[in-house]
Interface confidence: low
Protein backbone atom coordinates (compact mmCIF):
# COMPACT_ATOMS: atom_id res chain seq x y z
CA UNK A 1 0.00 0.00 0.00
CA UNK A 2 1.58 3.34 -0.98
CA UNK A 3 2.11 5.67 2.02
CA UNK A 4 -0.12 8.74 1.87
CA UNK A 5 1.97 11.86 2.30
CA UNK A 6 0.46 14.94 3.92
CA UNK A 7 0.31 17.84 1.46
CA UNK A 8 0.74 21.12 3.30
CA UNK A 9 -0.17 24.59 2.04
CA UNK A 10 3.26 26.15 2.43
CA UNK A 11 6.52 25.72 0.52
CA UNK A 12 8.67 22.72 1.40
CA UNK A 13 12.02 22.65 3.15
CA UNK A 14 14.65 24.85 1.52
CA UNK A 15 16.89 22.89 -0.88
CA UNK A 16 20.12 21.67 0.67
CA UNK A 17 18.83 22.70 4.12
CA UNK A 18 21.28 20.57 6.20
CA UNK A 19 24.28 21.74 4.18
CA UNK A 20 23.12 25.37 4.39
CA UNK A 21 22.71 25.32 8.18
CA UNK A 22 26.09 23.66 8.67
CA UNK A 23 27.86 26.04 6.27
CA UNK A 24 26.26 29.09 7.90
CA UNK A 25 27.29 27.88 11.33
CA UNK A 26 30.92 27.41 10.24
CA UNK A 27 30.96 30.82 8.58
CA UNK A 28 29.42 32.54 11.63
CA UNK A 29 31.89 31.01 14.08
CA UNK A 30 34.79 32.02 11.84
CA UNK A 31 33.60 35.64 11.69
CA UNK A 32 32.73 35.90 15.41
CA UNK A 33 35.70 34.86 17.57
CA UNK A 34 33.59 34.80 20.74
CA UNK A 35 31.64 31.90 19.20
CA UNK A 36 34.58 29.88 17.92
CA UNK A 37 34.09 27.28 20.66
CA UNK A 38 30.76 26.24 19.06
CA UNK A 39 30.71 22.72 17.59
CA UNK A 40 28.68 23.15 14.39
CA UNK A 41 27.99 19.44 13.99
CA UNK A 42 26.37 19.43 17.43
CA UNK A 43 24.39 22.54 16.45
CA UNK A 44 23.07 20.79 13.35
CA UNK A 45 22.24 17.65 15.34
CA UNK A 46 20.28 19.74 17.85
CA UNK A 47 18.50 21.66 15.07
CA UNK A 48 17.60 18.42 13.31
CA UNK A 49 16.44 16.84 16.57
CA UNK A 50 13.91 19.62 17.07
CA UNK A 51 11.74 18.62 14.10
CA UNK A 52 12.82 15.31 12.53
CA UNK A 53 10.35 12.41 13.10
CA UNK A 54 7.89 14.84 14.74
CA UNK A 55 4.50 15.85 13.42
CA UNK A 56 5.08 19.29 11.89
CA UNK A 57 1.96 20.70 13.54
CA UNK A 58 2.97 19.54 16.98
CA UNK A 59 6.30 21.31 17.58
CA UNK A 60 6.90 22.97 20.95
CA UNK A 61 9.47 25.37 22.38
CA UNK A 62 10.78 22.42 24.40
CA UNK A 63 11.80 20.74 21.14
CA UNK A 64 14.21 23.60 20.49
CA UNK A 65 15.78 23.64 23.96
CA UNK A 66 18.93 21.68 22.99
CA UNK A 67 19.52 24.10 20.09
CA UNK A 68 18.88 27.15 22.28
CA UNK A 69 21.42 25.87 24.75
CA UNK A 70 24.13 25.42 22.12
CA UNK A 71 23.34 28.86 20.74
CA UNK A 72 23.91 30.62 24.06
CA UNK A 73 25.47 33.93 23.12
CA UNK A 74 26.22 37.29 24.65
CA UNK A 75 24.95 40.33 22.78
CA UNK A 76 25.13 43.88 24.15
CA UNK A 77 21.69 44.18 25.72
CA UNK A 78 21.54 47.93 25.05
CA UNK A 79 22.32 47.58 21.33
CA UNK A 80 19.31 45.58 20.18
CA UNK A 81 17.36 46.50 17.05
CA UNK A 82 13.98 44.86 16.54
CA UNK A 83 12.11 45.14 13.25
CA UNK A 84 8.75 44.38 11.74
CA UNK A 85 8.04 43.92 8.03
CA UNK A 86 11.23 45.76 7.05
CA UNK A 87 13.97 43.21 7.49
CA UNK A 88 16.23 44.27 4.62
CA UNK A 89 16.69 47.85 5.83
CA UNK A 90 17.20 46.67 9.41
CA UNK A 91 19.97 44.34 8.23
CA UNK A 92 21.54 47.01 6.03
CA UNK A 93 21.57 49.27 9.09
CA UNK A 94 23.36 46.77 11.38
CA UNK A 95 25.86 46.01 8.61
CA UNK A 96 26.86 49.67 8.77
CA UNK A 97 26.26 50.29 12.49
CA UNK A 98 28.30 47.26 13.53
CA UNK A 99 27.70 47.60 17.26
CA UNK A 100 23.94 47.10 16.90
CA UNK A 101 22.31 43.70 16.52
CA UNK A 102 19.16 42.30 14.99
CA UNK A 103 18.12 38.76 15.86
CA UNK A 104 19.56 37.64 12.52
CA UNK A 105 22.98 38.97 13.59
CA UNK A 106 23.06 36.30 16.32
CA UNK A 107 24.08 32.73 15.60
CA UNK A 108 20.59 31.25 15.90
CA UNK A 109 18.95 33.95 13.79
CA UNK A 110 21.70 33.79 11.20
CA UNK A 111 21.33 30.02 10.84
CA UNK A 112 17.61 30.12 10.08
CA UNK A 113 17.15 33.42 8.27
CA UNK A 114 14.99 32.99 5.14
CA UNK A 115 14.92 29.20 5.45
CA UNK A 116 11.96 26.82 5.67
CA UNK A 117 12.06 23.36 7.21
CA UNK A 118 9.84 20.55 8.42
CA UNK A 119 9.87 16.81 8.86
CA UNK A 120 7.32 14.02 8.92
CA UNK A 121 5.85 12.11 11.81
CA UNK A 122 7.64 8.81 12.48
CA UNK A 123 10.14 9.04 9.61
CA UNK A 124 13.61 10.53 9.57
CA UNK A 125 12.89 12.28 6.25
CA UNK A 126 12.98 16.01 5.68
CA UNK A 127 9.90 17.14 3.72
CA UNK A 128 11.12 19.05 0.67
CA UNK A 129 7.66 19.04 -0.98
CA UNK A 130 5.58 21.12 1.44
CA UNK A 131 5.49 22.43 5.01
CA UNK A 132 2.60 23.73 7.12
CA UNK A 133 1.48 27.29 6.51
CA UNK A 134 0.98 29.33 9.72
CA UNK A 135 -2.55 30.45 8.78
CA UNK A 136 -3.86 27.68 6.55
CA UNK A 137 -2.45 24.66 8.37
CA UNK A 138 -1.18 25.23 11.90
CA UNK A 139 0.75 27.73 14.00
CA UNK A 140 2.82 25.14 15.91
CA UNK A 141 4.98 24.34 12.90
CA UNK A 142 8.80 24.05 13.07
CA UNK A 143 9.57 27.46 11.54
CA UNK A 144 6.99 29.49 13.49
CA UNK A 145 7.87 27.89 16.81
CA UNK A 146 11.59 28.46 16.19
CA UNK A 147 11.13 32.18 15.54
CA UNK A 148 8.74 32.56 18.46
CA UNK A 149 11.29 30.92 20.76
CA UNK A 150 14.35 32.90 19.70
CA UNK A 151 12.40 36.17 19.40
CA UNK A 152 11.07 35.86 22.93
CA UNK A 153 14.55 35.26 24.32
CA UNK A 154 16.04 38.09 22.28
CA UNK A 155 13.45 40.57 23.53
CA UNK A 156 13.86 39.33 27.10
CA UNK A 157 17.59 40.06 26.93
CA UNK A 158 17.15 43.68 25.83
CA UNK A 159 17.92 46.60 28.14
CA UNK A 160 18.09 50.40 28.31
CA UNK A 161 16.84 51.87 25.00
CA UNK A 162 15.50 49.30 22.54
CA UNK A 163 14.95 50.36 18.93
CA UNK A 164 12.40 48.94 16.53
CA UNK A 165 12.22 49.62 12.80
CA UNK A 166 8.66 49.66 11.42
CA UNK A 167 7.45 49.82 7.81
CA UNK A 168 5.52 53.05 7.24
CA UNK A 169 4.31 51.87 3.82
CA UNK A 170 2.07 49.17 5.25
CA UNK A 171 -1.58 49.66 6.16
CA UNK A 172 -0.79 48.46 9.69
CA UNK A 173 2.51 50.09 10.59
CA UNK A 174 2.36 48.26 13.91
CA UNK A 175 0.72 44.86 13.54
CA UNK A 176 -0.30 43.06 16.72
CA UNK A 177 -0.09 39.75 14.85
CA UNK A 178 3.53 40.17 13.74
CA UNK A 179 6.36 38.53 15.69
CA UNK A 180 7.24 41.95 17.05
CA UNK A 181 3.63 42.67 18.07
CA UNK A 182 2.74 39.26 19.45
CA UNK A 183 6.02 38.12 21.00
CA UNK A 184 8.75 40.72 21.36
CA UNK A 185 6.65 43.60 22.72
CA UNK A 186 5.33 41.39 25.51
CA UNK A 187 8.73 40.02 26.50
CA UNK A 188 10.63 43.27 26.98
CA UNK A 189 11.51 43.37 30.69
CA UNK A 190 10.24 46.62 32.29
CA UNK A 191 12.89 46.48 35.03
CA UNK A 192 15.63 46.48 32.37
CA UNK A 193 14.15 48.39 29.43
CA UNK A 194 13.73 52.12 29.92
CA UNK A 195 12.48 53.12 26.45
CA UNK A 196 11.23 51.57 23.24
CA UNK A 197 12.05 53.90 20.37
CA UNK A 198 10.20 53.25 17.11
CA UNK A 199 11.70 54.30 13.79
CA UNK A 200 8.91 54.56 11.22
CA UNK A 201 10.42 54.17 7.76
CA UNK A 202 8.70 56.14 5.01
CA UNK A 203 8.34 54.63 1.54
CA UNK A 204 7.51 57.52 -0.78
CA UNK A 205 9.99 60.32 -1.38
CA UNK A 206 7.28 62.99 -1.12
CA UNK A 207 5.67 61.50 1.97
CA UNK A 208 5.98 64.16 4.68
CA UNK A 209 3.20 62.93 6.97
CA UNK A 210 3.93 62.38 10.65
CA UNK A 211 3.42 58.62 10.75
CA UNK A 212 4.12 58.63 14.48
CA UNK A 213 0.52 59.83 14.81
CA UNK A 214 -0.80 56.72 13.02
CA UNK A 215 -3.49 54.90 15.06
CA UNK A 216 -1.48 51.67 15.12
CA UNK A 217 1.56 53.53 16.52
CA UNK A 218 -0.71 54.99 19.20
CA UNK A 219 -1.83 51.44 19.93
CA UNK A 220 1.81 50.37 20.30
CA UNK A 221 2.47 53.34 22.59
CA UNK A 222 -0.49 52.30 24.75
CA UNK A 223 0.71 48.68 25.04
CA UNK A 224 4.26 49.76 25.91
CA UNK A 225 3.17 52.42 28.40
CA UNK A 226 0.96 49.92 30.23
CA UNK A 227 4.08 47.79 30.67
CA UNK A 228 5.84 50.73 32.42
CA UNK A 229 8.22 51.29 29.51
CA UNK A 230 8.60 54.73 27.96
CA UNK A 231 7.84 55.11 24.26
CA UNK A 232 9.27 57.43 21.66
CA UNK A 233 8.85 57.59 17.90
CA UNK A 234 10.82 59.07 15.02
CA UNK A 235 9.93 59.42 11.35
CA UNK A 236 12.66 58.33 8.95
CA UNK A 237 11.52 60.23 5.86
CA UNK A 238 14.50 59.30 3.68
CA UNK A 239 15.77 55.77 4.45
CA UNK A 240 18.46 56.01 1.74
CA UNK A 241 19.82 59.21 3.30
CA UNK A 242 19.41 57.68 6.77
CA UNK A 243 21.75 54.81 5.85
CA UNK A 244 24.16 57.19 4.13
CA UNK A 245 24.32 59.34 7.25
CA UNK A 246 24.94 56.31 9.46
CA UNK A 247 27.91 55.52 7.20
CA UNK A 248 29.14 59.13 7.05
CA UNK A 249 27.73 61.06 10.04
CA UNK A 250 30.09 64.00 9.42
CA UNK A 251 28.48 64.70 6.01
CA UNK A 252 27.10 68.28 6.13
CA UNK A 253 23.72 67.17 4.71
CA UNK A 254 23.21 64.90 7.75
CA UNK A 255 22.44 67.71 10.17
CA UNK A 256 18.99 68.27 8.63
CA UNK A 257 15.99 66.03 9.24
CA UNK A 258 16.40 62.61 7.62
Amino acid sequence: VPRWRQQWSGPGTTKRFPETVLARCVKYTEIHPEMRHVDCQSVWDAFKGAFISKHPCNITEEDYQPLMKLGTQTVPCNKILLWSRIKDLAHQFTQVQRDMFTLEDTLLGYLADDLTWCGEFNTSKINYQSCPDWRKDCSNNPVSVFWKTVSRRFAEAACDVVHVMLNGSRSKIFDKNSTFGSVEVHNLQPEKVQTLEAWVIHGGREDSRDLCQDPTIKELESIISKRNIQFSCKNIYRPDKFLQCVKNPEDSSCTSEI
Partner: antibody
Amino acid sequence: QVQLQQSGPELVRPGASVKISCKTSGYAFSGSWMNWVKQRPGQGLEWIGRIYPGDGDIIYNGNFRDKVTLSADKSSNTAYMQLSSLTSVDSAVYFCSRWGTFTPSFDYWGQGTTLTVSS
Amino acid sequence: DIVMTQSHKFLSTSVGDRVSITCKASQDVVTAVAWFQQKPGQSPKLLIYSASHRYTGVPDRFTGSGSGTDFTFTIISVQAEDLAVYYCQQHYTTPTTFGGGTKLDFR
Protein backbone atom coordinates in the same frame (compact mmCIF):
# COMPACT_ATOMS: atom_id res chain seq x y z
CA GLN B 1 10.31 41.02 36.80
CA VAL B 2 13.04 38.38 37.06
CA GLN B 3 13.50 37.02 40.60
CA LEU B 4 15.56 34.22 42.14
CA GLN B 5 14.45 33.36 45.69
CA GLN B 6 16.65 30.96 47.65
CA SER B 7 15.74 28.82 50.66
CA GLY B 8 16.71 29.91 54.17
CA PRO B 9 19.88 29.31 56.23
CA GLU B 10 20.83 25.75 57.17
CA LEU B 11 22.66 24.41 60.22
CA VAL B 12 23.61 20.74 59.73
CA ARG B 13 25.84 18.10 61.30
CA PRO B 14 29.04 16.81 59.66
CA GLY B 15 28.36 13.83 57.39
CA ALA B 16 24.77 14.89 56.67
CA SER B 17 23.28 16.14 53.38
CA VAL B 18 21.38 19.30 52.55
CA LYS B 19 19.27 20.48 49.61
CA ILE B 20 19.11 24.17 48.76
CA SER B 21 16.40 25.54 46.48
CA CYS B 22 16.26 28.49 44.10
CA LYS B 23 12.71 29.42 43.03
CA THR B 24 12.55 31.58 39.93
CA SER B 25 9.93 33.83 38.36
CA GLY B 26 9.66 36.42 35.60
CA TYR B 27 11.47 34.57 32.81
CA ALA B 28 11.49 31.31 30.85
CA PHE B 29 13.09 28.99 33.41
CA SER B 30 13.56 26.12 30.92
CA GLY B 31 15.64 28.21 28.56
CA SER B 32 18.44 29.61 30.70
CA TRP B 33 21.40 27.94 32.38
CA MET B 34 21.14 28.08 36.16
CA ASN B 35 24.52 28.37 37.87
CA TRP B 36 25.55 27.76 41.46
CA VAL B 37 28.40 29.65 43.13
CA LYS B 38 30.10 29.08 46.50
CA GLN B 39 31.57 31.76 48.75
CA ARG B 40 33.35 30.84 51.95
CA PRO B 41 33.43 33.46 54.74
CA GLY B 42 35.74 36.29 53.74
CA GLN B 43 36.73 34.45 50.54
CA GLY B 44 36.14 34.82 46.82
CA LEU B 45 33.64 33.22 44.45
CA GLU B 46 33.90 29.66 43.18
CA TRP B 47 31.70 28.26 40.41
CA ILE B 48 30.15 24.90 41.30
CA GLY B 49 28.25 23.98 38.15
CA ARG B 50 25.24 24.69 36.02
CA ILE B 51 22.04 23.01 34.88
CA TYR B 52 19.93 23.61 31.79
CA PRO B 53 16.35 22.94 32.95
CA GLY B 54 15.07 22.54 29.38
CA ASP B 55 16.70 19.14 28.96
CA GLY B 56 18.34 18.51 32.33
CA ASP B 57 21.90 18.85 31.01
CA ILE B 58 24.39 19.42 33.84
CA ILE B 59 28.00 20.58 33.82
CA TYR B 60 30.00 20.39 37.04
CA ASN B 61 33.22 22.00 38.09
CA GLY B 62 35.47 18.96 38.61
CA ASN B 63 36.27 20.12 42.14
CA PHE B 64 32.63 19.61 43.16
CA ARG B 65 31.70 16.53 41.15
CA ASP B 66 31.60 14.20 44.18
CA LYS B 67 30.06 16.76 46.50
CA VAL B 68 27.14 18.25 44.58
CA THR B 69 24.03 17.08 42.73
CA LEU B 70 22.10 19.65 40.68
CA SER B 71 18.49 19.22 39.63
CA ALA B 72 15.57 21.28 38.38
CA ASP B 73 11.80 21.04 38.49
CA LYS B 74 10.23 22.73 35.47
CA SER B 75 6.72 22.51 36.89
CA SER B 76 7.63 24.79 39.81
CA ASN B 77 10.42 26.76 38.05
CA THR B 78 12.80 25.75 40.82
CA ALA B 79 16.46 24.70 40.73
CA TYR B 80 18.02 22.60 43.47
CA MET B 81 21.53 21.87 44.70
CA GLN B 82 22.16 18.95 47.04
CA LEU B 83 25.42 18.78 49.00
CA SER B 84 26.40 15.48 50.60
CA SER B 85 28.93 14.16 53.15
CA LEU B 86 29.20 17.61 54.63
CA THR B 87 32.30 18.83 56.45
CA SER B 88 33.31 22.18 57.88
CA VAL B 89 34.88 23.24 54.55
CA ASP B 90 31.38 23.18 53.04
CA SER B 91 30.31 25.97 55.39
CA ALA B 92 29.70 28.88 53.01
CA VAL B 93 27.13 31.07 51.33
CA TYR B 94 25.74 29.45 48.17
CA PHE B 95 24.26 31.54 45.37
CA CYS B 96 22.16 30.61 42.36
CA SER B 97 22.58 32.80 39.29
CA ARG B 98 21.14 32.58 35.82
CA TRP B 99 22.61 33.01 32.35
CA GLY B 100 20.11 33.23 29.48
CA THR B 101 20.61 32.55 25.80
CA PHE B 102 21.17 36.20 24.87
CA THR B 103 21.76 37.49 28.36
CA PRO B 104 25.16 38.92 29.21
CA SER B 105 26.93 36.99 31.94
CA PHE B 106 25.41 36.17 35.34
CA ASP B 107 22.83 38.94 35.33
CA TYR B 108 20.46 37.86 38.10
CA TRP B 109 21.48 36.33 41.44
CA GLY B 110 19.61 34.80 44.36
CA GLN B 111 20.09 36.40 47.76
CA GLY B 112 22.32 33.53 48.93
CA THR B 113 21.80 30.64 51.36
CA THR B 114 24.11 30.35 54.35
CA LEU B 115 25.14 26.78 55.18
CA THR B 116 26.83 26.09 58.52
CA VAL B 117 28.25 22.63 59.14
CA SER B 118 28.89 22.12 62.83
CA SER B 119 28.58 19.40 65.45
CA ASP C 1 41.44 25.85 34.44
CA ILE C 2 42.01 29.48 33.53
CA VAL C 3 43.37 31.47 36.47
CA MET C 4 42.19 35.07 36.85
CA THR C 5 44.66 37.11 38.90
CA GLN C 6 43.67 40.39 40.53
CA SER C 7 47.00 41.78 41.65
CA HIS C 8 45.64 43.96 44.47
CA LYS C 9 43.67 42.43 47.33
CA PHE C 10 43.08 45.91 48.73
CA LEU C 11 43.00 49.37 47.18
CA SER C 12 42.72 52.56 49.22
CA THR C 13 41.00 55.54 47.66
CA SER C 14 39.11 58.75 48.43
CA VAL C 15 35.82 60.17 47.21
CA GLY C 16 36.32 61.71 43.77
CA ASP C 17 39.44 59.68 42.98
CA ARG C 18 39.90 57.68 39.79
CA VAL C 19 40.72 54.06 40.61
CA SER C 20 41.60 51.13 38.36
CA ILE C 21 41.55 47.42 39.17
CA THR C 22 43.44 45.02 36.93
CA CYS C 23 42.80 41.39 36.15
CA LYS C 24 45.12 39.06 34.25
CA ALA C 25 43.98 35.80 32.64
CA SER C 26 46.39 32.86 32.45
CA GLN C 27 45.43 32.40 28.77
CA ASP C 28 43.56 34.25 26.01
CA VAL C 29 39.89 34.74 26.90
CA VAL C 30 39.14 37.18 24.02
CA THR C 31 36.62 39.60 25.63
CA ALA C 32 34.67 37.04 27.67
CA VAL C 33 35.18 38.88 30.96
CA ALA C 34 32.67 40.33 33.42
CA TRP C 35 33.12 42.50 36.49
CA PHE C 36 30.98 42.23 39.63
CA GLN C 37 30.53 44.38 42.71
CA GLN C 38 29.74 42.75 46.05
CA LYS C 39 28.84 44.64 49.20
CA PRO C 40 28.86 42.95 52.64
CA GLY C 41 25.92 40.59 53.13
CA GLN C 42 24.74 40.98 49.55
CA SER C 43 24.93 38.90 46.38
CA PRO C 44 27.29 39.98 43.59
CA LYS C 45 25.96 42.54 41.14
CA LEU C 46 26.89 42.57 37.44
CA LEU C 47 28.52 45.84 36.36
CA ILE C 48 30.42 45.11 33.14
CA TYR C 49 30.12 42.26 30.65
CA SER C 50 32.02 41.36 27.49
CA ALA C 51 35.00 43.30 28.92
CA SER C 52 33.65 46.77 28.17
CA HIS C 53 29.84 46.79 28.05
CA ARG C 54 28.13 48.50 30.97
CA TYR C 55 25.14 46.55 32.24
CA THR C 56 21.73 48.17 32.41
CA GLY C 57 21.29 50.70 35.22
CA VAL C 58 25.01 50.80 36.03
CA PRO C 59 26.29 54.40 36.42
CA ASP C 60 28.63 55.57 33.66
CA ARG C 61 31.45 56.20 36.13
CA PHE C 62 32.09 52.43 35.90
CA THR C 63 34.03 51.37 32.79
CA GLY C 64 35.82 48.27 31.59
CA SER C 65 38.47 47.66 28.96
CA GLY C 66 40.88 45.04 27.66
CA SER C 67 40.98 41.89 25.58
CA GLY C 68 43.07 38.74 25.39
CA THR C 69 44.71 38.37 28.80
CA ASP C 70 44.75 41.87 30.33
CA PHE C 71 41.65 43.58 31.63
CA THR C 72 41.01 46.79 33.56
CA PHE C 73 38.00 47.97 35.53
CA THR C 74 37.89 51.69 36.31
CA ILE C 75 35.76 53.89 38.54
CA ILE C 76 36.22 57.36 37.09
CA SER C 77 35.13 59.24 40.22
CA VAL C 78 34.71 57.10 43.32
CA GLN C 79 31.56 57.64 45.41
CA ALA C 80 31.05 56.57 49.03
CA GLU C 81 28.61 53.84 47.94
CA ASP C 82 31.32 52.24 45.76
CA LEU C 83 33.07 50.72 48.78
CA ALA C 84 32.83 47.00 48.04
CA VAL C 85 34.75 44.01 46.75
CA TYR C 86 35.14 43.83 42.97
CA TYR C 87 35.59 40.52 41.11
CA CYS C 88 36.53 39.76 37.54
CA GLN C 89 35.23 36.58 35.91
CA GLN C 90 36.10 34.79 32.68
CA HIS C 91 33.41 32.77 30.91
CA TYR C 92 35.44 31.86 27.84
CA THR C 93 35.90 28.25 28.90
CA THR C 94 34.33 25.90 31.43
CA PRO C 95 34.80 26.07 34.33
CA THR C 96 34.13 29.76 34.53
CA THR C 97 36.56 31.26 37.05
CA PHE C 98 36.66 34.38 39.19
CA GLY C 99 39.53 36.56 40.31
CA GLY C 100 40.32 36.65 44.01
CA GLY C 101 38.63 40.02 44.47
CA THR C 102 39.85 43.53 45.18
CA LYS C 103 38.48 45.33 48.23
CA LEU C 104 38.07 49.05 47.80
CA ASP C 105 38.29 51.04 51.03
CA PHE C 106 38.82 54.65 52.06
CA ARG C 107 42.13 56.07 53.14
